[in-house]
């Protein structure tokens, strides 16, 4: 009874819930549950019976494999799904699939919290803002990743001439998607002066974005 599989999928996708092993031979009945007591569908050697539930009309059972197809999953479909098989012998066997449905991450906005000349060095504090999501952050300077210990929503670093980068990219990701945001600086320590700067993010799996100084909320200190 202890088979538990974890699945993570992106919201809006079509999902197949199935087990990695073969079903018991000539089983008598098969049931899929949402949580522990909500039946979705049951097969009993003659037909599939789809019950009243939030899944009605967007699920399909394959009695041969036991696979359950769910279309257009949403975050509300997060649950442990249970497949119960009643064998010809009278015994039951259960498999559990814990489904996690995640929304694609939104495109982050980079806020310049502080930018300050300090002799030949440049103190920089950037924050990567996305609305209430649990995500991973990766910062890049000219497409080279910063060390792991700097990987959170705020990048705070002192730039010296030898490690100065022109563009800073924040990549936010969860297990189903990732998006990037980028800001560029002009040496030694100012925002890029062009009114509009085209930043290519193709190498980081993002998209091209037209960014202007006016788009950036920042405190600019000299």
């Amino acid at each position: 009874q202890g088979h538990l599989v974890h699945m993570t999928v992106v919201s809006g996708s079509n999902v197949t819930l199935n087990i990695s092993e073969s079903l018991p031979e000539n089983y008598k009945q098969l049931t899929w549950f949402y949580t522990f007591d909500q039946k979705i569908v049951e097969w009993d050697s003659r037909k599939s019976k789809y019950f009243e539930s939030k899944f009605k009309g967007r699920v399909r059972l394959d009695p041969q494999s036991g696979a359950l197809y769910i279309s257009k999953v949403q975050k509300e479909d997060n649950s442990t799904y249970i497949m119960r098989v009643l064998k010809k012998t009278g015994n039951e066997q259960e498999w559990k699939i814990k489904l996690q449905v995640l929304d694609p991450v939104p495109k982050p906005v980079i806020k310049i919290e502080k930018i300050e000349d300090m002799d030949d060095n440049c103190y920089l504090k950037l924050s990567c803002v996305i609305p209430g999501e649990s995500v991973n952050y990766t910062w890049y300077g000219d497409k080279r990743p910063f060390p792991k210990e700097l990987q959170n929503s705020v990048l705070e670093t002192t730039l010296m001439p030898h490690n100065y980068s022109r563009c800073y990219t924040c990549q936010v990701s969860n297990s189903v998607s990732s998006k990037n945001g980028t800001v560029c600086l002009s040496p030694p320590c100012t925002l890029a002066r062009s009114e509009q700067k085209l930043i290519s993010e193709e190498d980081l799996g993002g998209e091209q974005k037209l960014i202007s100084e006016e788009d950036l909320h920042h405190h600019h200190h000299h």
Partner: antibody, heavy 121, light 107 residues
């Protein structure tokens, strides 16, 4: 939580019919079958028959064939058992019980509280 | 019809005792067997299904075993609330049939 609530006690004359109801709550009614079981005073349990709440399929014990009718009303999540041509030996407590499956498996996981039917002239 | 025979028909025991009730089917029923408990004036309560699977919410002191024709229900350490009548029932084929019951009494 799952509940099966049965109708109240009945007193019937020999030859009459009785209809016992079993109202289900706390689960999707059509996803399970209902069996009917009776128990005469001081005696053991006797299975009478089964009905699928999904499609109305039934299977009755031979002993009650032609005398018992089992039905469901999905709009009210209620199962009914009607027993006709009552005799004194039909005096018993009648129970409904939920089957774990929509097609009968014979495994009952929840029982109603019982309905006493007394047949007396 | 499949006949189900329980033994003993009654048994006296004390709190804390280990009790075993047996059930024999008149033909092979594989694991298609259930056990239920009934207290006076109350509806039966499901304990075990598929010969050895514990019904949800039933204490683990109850266990079932066997297959084919011979089955047992064991209560590992009797509690005061366990004194009742126990029934086995075959689910192998229609008509489903019950054993005659085993009454468990306080010694």
């Amino acid at each position: 939580q799952v509940q099966l609530v049965q109708s109240g006690a009945e007193v019937k004359k020999p030859g009459a019919a009785v209809k016992v109801s079993c109202k289900a709550s706390g689960y999707t009614f059509t996803a399970y079958g209902i069996s009917w079981v009776r128990q005469a005073p001081g005696q053991g349990l006797e299975w009478m028959g089964w009905i699928s709440a999904y499609d109305g399929d039934t299977n009755n014990a031979q002993k009650f064939q032609g005398r018992v009718t089992m039905t469901t009303d999905t709009s009210s999540s209620t199962a009914y058992m009607e027993l006709r041509s009552l005799g004194s030996d039909d005096t018993a407590v009648y129970y409904c019980a939920r089957d774990r499956y929509s097609s009968s498996s014979g495994y009952f996981d929840y029982w109603g509280q019982g309905t006493l039917v007394t047949v007396s002239s | 019809d499949i006949q189900m025979t329980q033994s003993p028909s009654s048994v006296s025991a004390s709190v804390g005792d280990r009790v075993t009730i047996t059930c024999r089917a008149s033909q092979d029923i594989s694991s298609w067997l259930a056990w239920s408990q009934q207290k006076p004036g109350k509806a039966p309560k499901a304990l075990i299904y598929a010969a050895s699977s514990l019904q949800s919410g039933v204490p683990s002191r109850f266990s079932g075993s066997g297959s084919g024709t011979d089955f047992t229900l064991t209560i590992s350490s009797l509690q005061p609330e366990d004194f009742a009548t126990y029934y086995c029932q075959q689910a192998n084929s229609f008509p489903y049939t019950f054993g005659q019951g085993t009454k468990l009494e306080i010694k």
